[in-house]
């Protein structure tokens, strides 16, 4: 059996020892349970010397980042892909991962995830722009493609534990977060629950047991606890704004 290793990291999707699986938020763990230490990528970085992190897919980036070519011109022409900052509400997008947590990509625009989109039986038309070197590219010729996907959605939203690919696959109050073998629908965190504070840096490995994000009106903040000796070991919890 591999030895347990303790690691304290604020890296997004870094792989500390597994923990907190059943209701996890994308990002690394703050509190750590014994387990296997999985290899990550880069060592810790500060914002001062932040380097763009090369990636092959969105999962290698933070939950507030997505994987893409830094300029459209470079896409599909051997241009390296890096983790880019997620796009805020009403910004243009090509897929869900480009939008910041709590948003999803609809008709090429980042929209708030209110779980009312894609109602059962509705015909949903999404414009997806595929770049040749992009994460979900259908064509390999390096030129942008615009495809209108029309799909009738008859299935019910995923319940807790259902396998998903994105949060829009999950029922209200759930998000899609990694749980090792796959991503599954997990509960959005409530007030007082342990959360993961995201930072745009760190050892960009992959966290396999993620937590969901904090629910509406809540923010992930350091728990005010005078018994904690150092900031690095403090728990973050979902707190009212």
């Amino acid at each position: 059996t591999l030895n347990s290793v303790l690691i304290n990291s604020n890296a997004i999707k870094n792989l500390p020892p597994p923990l907190g699986g059943a209701g996890g938020q994308p990002g690394s763990a703050v509190s750590v349970a014994p387990g296997v230490l999985y290899e990550g990528g880069n060592k810790y970085q500060t914002l001062d010397n932040y380097q763009p992190y090369p990636c092959a897919e969105d999962e290698e980036c933070g939950s507030d980042e997505y994987c893409s070519s830094p300029s459209r011109g470079a896409a599909g022409v051997g241009g390296v892909q890096i983790c880019l900052a997620c796009r805020k509400r009403r910004k243009r997008c090509m897929r869900h991962a480009m939008c910041c947590p709590g948003n999803y990509c609809k008709n090429g625009i980042c929209m708030p995830s209110d779980h009312s989109h894609f109602p059962r039986g509705e015909i949903e038309e999404s414009i997806i722009e595929n770049l040749g070197n992009d994460h979900n590219a259908a064509a390999g010729d390096g030129y942008p493609r615009r495809t209108t996907l029309t799909s009738k959605i008859y299935h019910t939203k995923g319940q807790e534990g259902s396998v998903c690919l994105r949060s829009s696959d999950c029922a209200a109050g759930l998000c899609c977060a990694r749980h090792f073998w796959s991503k599954i629908c997990k509960p959005v965190l409530k007030e007082g629950q342990v959360c993961t504070k995201h930072k745009r840096k760190g050892s960009h490995g992959l966290e396999i047991f993620q937590r969901c994000y904090c629910g509406e009106g809540l923010a992930c903040r350091i728990q005010k606890d005078h018994h904690q000796a150092s900031n690095s070991s403090r728990l973050h919890t979902c707190q009212r704004h």
Epitope: S4, P18, L19, G20, G21, A22, G23, A33, P34, G35, V36, E59, N136, Q159, E160, G161, V163, L165, R178, H179, F180, W181, S182, L206, I208, F209
Partner: antibody, heavy 112, light 112 residues
Framework: EVQLVQSGAEVKKPGASVKVSCKAS????????IHWVRQAPGQGLEWMGW????????TYAQKFQARVTMSRDTSSSTAYMELSRLESDDTAMYFC?????WGKGTMVTVSS | QAVLTQPSSVSGAPGQRVSISCTGS?????????VHWYQQLPGTAPRLLIY???NRPSGVPDRFSGSKSGTSASLVIAGLQAEDEADYYC???????????FGTGTKLTVLG
């Protein structure tokens, strides 16, 4: 250290039921799912289903839907898998798994 | 018919490089579900070798690597060693079966 300790080998007659246990330690039991996977002698791995250790919610592979029951006891951090109406081809090693950690397996032999 | 197909056996001499394929379809690997690889020595539980397509747990030598493309995945073992002789399984999720699925398994023989 994360450990999943399974119950001992069982010999059952066709038509009977078997209940295999999996005791977890070294982590917060209710934070994870427990999966059950079986392997017949000389054969490959076959996923049977999972149980959410906290809520007790289950999902079973269609093949086992009518015969399997997964349960858990949070007070003892133990998961259970019961398979009923046993047939000879249910003879297999049954593993419990936390996905990243696996138990050593419980051999169930079905023989008349 | 198996959902994830692997060659039943592969072999190589010590020091050689071998590749094990895992062929799926648009409802599993091709649907963007992750692939994991397990090594199983005789009489033991599966051991995680590669997780989420191409990541290695600590303790797994860097001779082992994984990749995924389209509807298939591959496990490459560079610099074969005698202790690599084992069964290897790929694993993913299939959305048409609503089940986690394992590959058919590949027996690796190290010659000499």
């Amino acid at each position: 250290e994360v450990q999943l300790v399974q119950s001992g080998a069982e010999v059952k007659k066709p038509g009977a039921s078997v209940k295999v246990s999996c005791k977890a330690s070294g982590y917060t039991f209710t934070d994870y799912y427990i999966h059950w996977v079986r392997q017949a002698p000389g054969q490959g791995l076959e996923w049977m289903g999972w149980i959410h250790s906290n809520s007790g919610a289950t999902t079973y592979a269609q093949k086992f839907q009518a015969r399997v029951t997964m349960s858990r006891d949070t007070s003892s951090s133990t998961a259970y898998m019961e398979l009923s109406r046993l047939e000879s081809d249910d003879t297999a090693m049954y593993f419990c798994s936390r996905e990243d950690y696996w138990g050593k397996g419980t051999m169930v032999t079905v023989s008349s | 018919q198996a959902v994830l197909t692997q060659p039943s056996s592969v072999s190589g001499a010590p020091g050689q490089r071998v590749s094990i394929s895992c062929t799926g379809s648009s409802s599993n690997i091709g649907a963007a579900y992750d692939v994991h690889w397990y090594q199983q020595l005789p009489g033991t539980a599966p051991r995680l070798l590669i997780y989420v397509n191409n990541n290695r747990p600590s303790g797994v030598p860097d001779r082992f690597s994984g990749s995924k493309s389209g509807t298939s995945a591959s496990l490459v073992i560079a610099g074969l060693q005698a202790e690599d002789e084992a069964d290897y399984y790929c694993q993913s999720y299939d959305n048409s079966l609503n089940a986690y699925v394992f590959g058919t398994g590949t027996k690796l023989t190290v010659l000499g």
